[in-house]
């Protein structure tokens, strides 16, 4: 417990103290004040250094004396033979004798009192930073105007800390600039502009004036700029020794200034400003920026457009274009989105054609699409070469977007009619050899396929029954083979206005227009033994000439039979009509003069009684087509004659084209466009 | 199929916060950006912001910056919005949406209810 | 922020009809607006984006037309299952924003 005041005697005092003895006091004043030791006697073994007998007095670690031998007072008005002084509150005595003593020796007698120190003045180390204040058993620090005493009751500081800048311009600076900062400060500034700002600071070298580093390097009053997880700093020294424009990229940003004690400048000031975040100008692959600029910043927006043949896709939706706005964070929006290659997709299919799986139908692809040749060819032309375009399309050279349209080759036979052994008016055939030849069973008679939809025939065969029944791809006609072959089923006859109907067909005279079209529900699947013929041309290439040849095929009445069961075929020439006018009708059921002959008629046969008879009727009387050699047209229709196996009439198929197109193209089906 | 499912109503008292979820299935959400949008009773669409899922990248409508919190987790294919310090304004309906070009898709929304 | 304001909060219109709503911006936004349809009790339905392009199985009733500050949505022949509210909004930049919704009714 520590006491103001006390007494310290050595043992026995004041008979002789005994040998090898070891004593010590401690001595304990209150916090605040210091001791003052002092003796009234003193009577120990004189020895050098005080080696054999001794009182030492020990403050702390420090050996404040020791003391031996005798002494007195020098002054007659006091008892005090030696003092001690300390200014710590703690004290420590130990007496020490050794093991003889020459002489008797009394010891010492000695008291201490609690005295006032002055921590203001006793102390190497100032207690205070600016004024210290002393008083009995203690102190206080005291600060000048402005200054403020720090929580440790020792140091003082300026309160410069606190201040929030908002504005998007601005000007810092330390206290009291330009006149010396203040010393053991520490000042926080804060800078918080709009997101979408940085906050960038600029410094002119002359402005900055703080203490040097120390010999280490490190600066022992100094500058720091925090932004985030940025830091730049820590400053110090004489001119700024950092960079003169630093931009933070943040948009929040704090200034720590750091003071100690000593070595005061003038400080520093500073200017700051926002500057719209930047964006970086992104490289994206294929598009193109709008506004294009070198520099792009917060609130920004670019039109980022693709390239041809690029798209953005959005599930099953594209588009060519999309903005995109430099943001408050320094990112752009929608980066995400990457123009990538137009996709064409699965290439649609044709009918009578085909198109080979593609590699790839990314924009650029190509593709070919192919006829199923030799039946098929491509009627629009352009090649049949696609590529994958722009805008997401397989477009061709010629017809853009348009499919190709492989129609049936008309006209070529895939076995050439060669006339064998003589048969009574003709040969036997194969449908190879007339692949457009259609059999008709009520009435039994034929007709010529003109293309996948049509039939051309005589007018005289359909007009008793507007629904035939139609077979194609069969040499013979046998029930057996017909269940076989393709039967056809008629959507409609169209009957040429110019043909006369009358009550009682059996009694015609006048064969004029004796020409029919019927039109099939479905379309007819092209081949070896199915294949249309072709229609003459309306040029002067296309009129007959005397003697020019043609052939006619069917399973009409022959020589030996009413009907034919196989094919047959005849190579006739073209005769003048006065050739047919002169035969006799054979079973006329009319006056010879009542039979009407017609420049819409051509006269055939007339050779070694080679001619068509009943039931070959509406089957194309097939010439050579002068501009294509490989190519047979329809010149003629079987039509009426005066009797079998002379001359024949056949209806001029060229006089009809223009009906026969109008009619086809009035009543096709969307299928067929 | 493109679907996005909300997690179920809530009701909650004022001062607390909720999270909402909205899992994807039918597309990753890492090739779009997912939107949270409020809708007070009777009242219009308010968009509160997206998130990348690719990169955490977020972006808010200044308004709700500090309100709302857009978060995902990319290996459960799944996006978040977490409202803190709820007050009866925060009562509405929130839908997430998925978008590239524009909110193609939307939840079927989450009803909220702050009520002491 | 961008303000999308759509003029009328109601229209009334009978099947049959042509009906179109109007959305302004209150600055350039290009042709960045889609228009939504939102009946009630569900979520929002993308109807138009980009101004005027149709939505993937949106009938060719819904059109859109605009570009720059004014906007228009029209639906020509109205169905008695168009009974929705119509928003329109903006993506041409962050915040995206809204229109306040024009709510169609049937009479």
């Known amino acids: 417990e520590p006491t103001m005041y006390g007494e310290i005697l050595s043992p026995n005092y004041p008979q002789a103290y005994p040998s090898e003895v070891e004593k010590s006091w401690d001595i304990e004043v209150p916090e605040g004040y210091g001791i003052h030791l002092y003796f009234t006697h003193l009577d120990i073994e004189l020895s050098e250094n005080c080696a054999y007998d001794s009182v030492q007095i020990i403050s702390g670690d420090t050996e404040e004396g020791r003391l031996c031998g005798q002494r007195s007072s020098n002054n007659p008005h006091s008892p005090i033979v030696e003092e001690f002084q300390v200014p710590y509150n703690k004290l420590q005595v130990i007496f020490k004798s050794d093991f003889s003593n020459e002489e008797r020796f009394t010891g010492f007698a000695a008291y201490y009192v609690a005295t006032d120190i002055n921590e203001c003045t006793d102390f190497v180390d100032v207690p205070c930073s600016h004024f210290c204040n002393n008083f009995i058993g203690g102190y206080f620090c005291s600060c000048p105007p402005e200054y403020f005493l720090h929580d440790d009751m020792k140091n003082c500081g300026v309160n410069c800390s606190g201040d929030v800048f908002t504005a998007l311009i601005g000007e810092i600076a330390s206290p009291n600039y330009p006149k010396p900062y203040p010393e053991n400060s520490r000042c926080e500034y804060q800078i918080r502009l709009e997101k979408g700002f940085q906050v960038v600071v600029t410094l002119r070298r002359e402005d900055f004036d703080v203490e040097a580093a120390d010999s280490a390097g490190n600066c022992l009053d100094s500058l720091v700029f925090v932004a985030g997880d940025r830091q730049f700093g820590p400053y110090c020294g004489h001119g700024f020794p950092g960079p003169l424009n630093i931009e933070t990229k943040s948009n929040a940003l704090d200034i720590i200034f750091q003071t100690d004690l000593t070595g005061q400048k003038k400080g520093w000031k500073l200017r700051y400003h926002g500057d719209p975040m930047p964006c970086p100008k992104e490289d994206t692959p294929n598009s193109v920026w709008e506004p294009a600029k070198a520099k792009y910043v917060f609130r920004d927006v670019v039109q980022i457009t693709c390239l041809d043949g690029f798209e953005v896709v959005e599930g099953r939706v594209g588009a060519t274009s999309f903005y995109s706005t430099c943001q408050s964070n320094g990112k752009w929006s929608n980066s995400k989105l990457k123009c990538q290659p137009v996709d064409c997709g699965i290439p649609e299919s044709i009918e009578n054609g085909k198109v080979e799986d593609p590699e790839s139908t990314l924009f650029g692809s190509v593709i070919r699409y192919t006829c199923e040749e030799p039946y098929y060819y491509m009627e629009n032309g352009g090649g049949g070469e696609y590529h994958c375009a722009g805008n997401g399309s397989w477009v061709n050279e010629v017809l853009g977007p348009e499919l190709p349209k492989c129609v049936p080759v008309c006209g070529v036979p895939r076995e050439p009619f060669e006339e064998k052994q003589r048969i009574i008016g003709g040969s036997d055939a194969d449908i190879k050899n007339f692949p457009w030849q259609v059999f008709f069973d009520n009435p039994w008679a034929g007709g010529a396929l003109i293309n996948e939809y049509w039939v051309l025939t005589a007018a005289h065969v359909v007009e008793g029954n507007r629904e035939p029944t139609m077979y194609v791809g069969s040499t013979s006609v046998q029930t057996s083979r017909l269940a076989k072959s393709k039967m056809l089923t008629p959507e409609h006859v169209f009957i040429h206005p110019g043909w006369k109907l009358l009550e009682v067909p059996e009694g015609r005279t006048n064969f004029d227009n004796d020409i029919a079209l019927v039109r099939l529900k479905d379309p007819v699947k092209m081949g070896p033994t199915v294949s249309p013929i072709c229609l003459p041309g309306t040029s002067s290439d296309y009129n007959l000439m005397d003697g020019d040849l043609g052939l006619i095929s069917g399973w009409g009445r022959t020589e030996k039979r009413d009907r034919a069961v196989r094919l047959k075929a005849a190579r006739l020439p073209v005769a003048p009509l006065r050739k047919c006018k002169e035969v006799k009708v054979e079973k006329p059921t009319a006056d010879a003069e009542a039979y009407v002959f017609t420049p819409n008629m051509i006269c055939a046969g007339g050779e070694k009684g080679m001619d068509s008879c009943k039931g070959d009727s509406g089957g194309a009387f097939a010439v050579q087509d002068p501009n294509d050699k490989t190519k047979f047209y329809a010149a003629g229709l079987v039509s009426w004659g005066p009797q079998c196996g002379t001359y024949g009439l056949y209806t001029r198929v060229k006089n009809y084209v223009d009906w026969i197109m109008k009619t086809m193209q009035e009543n096709s089906t969307p299928r067929e466009d | 199929e493109v679907q996005l499912q909300q997690s179920g109503a809530e009701l909650v008292r004022p001062g607390a916060l909720v999270k909402l979820s909205c899992k994807a299935s039918?597309?990753?959400?890492?090739?779009?950006?997912m939107h949270w949008v409020k809708q007070r009773p009777e009242q219009g669409l308010e968009w509160i912001g997206w998130?990348?899922?690719?990169?955490?990248?977020?972006i808010y409508d200044p308004k709700f910056q500090g309100k709302a919190s857009i978060t995902a987790d990319t290996s459960s294919n799944t996006a978040y919005l977490q409202l803190s310090s709820l007050t009866s304004e925060d009562t509405a309906v929130y839908y997430c949406?998925?978008?590239?070009?524009?909110?193609?898709?939307w939840g079927q929304g989450t009803l909220v209810t702050v009520s002491a | 922020d961008i303000v999308m304001t759509q003029s009328h909060k109601f229209m009334s219109t009978s099947v049959g009809d042509r009906v179109s709503f109007t959305c302004k911006a209150s600055?350039?936004?290009?042709?960045?607006v889609d228009w939504y349809q939102q009946k009630p009790g569900q979520s929002p339905k993308l109807l138009i984006y980009?101004?005027?392009y149709r939505y993937t199985g949106v009938p060719d009733r819904f059109t859109g037309t605009g570009s720059g500050t004014d906007f228009t949505f029209t639906i020509s022949s109205v169905q008695a299952e168009d009974l929705a509210v119509y928003f329109c909004q903006q993506q041409y930049t962050t915040p995206y924003t809204f229109g306040g919704g024009t709510k169609l009714e049937i009479k």
């Open positions: 600055q350039d936004v290009r042709t960045a």
């Open positions: 039918g597309f990753n959400i890492k090739e779009y950006y």
């Open positions: 998130i990348d899922p690719e990169n955490g990248d977020t």
């Open positions: 949406a998925r978008s590239r070009l524009f909110f193609a898709y």
């Open positions: 980009s101004a005027s």
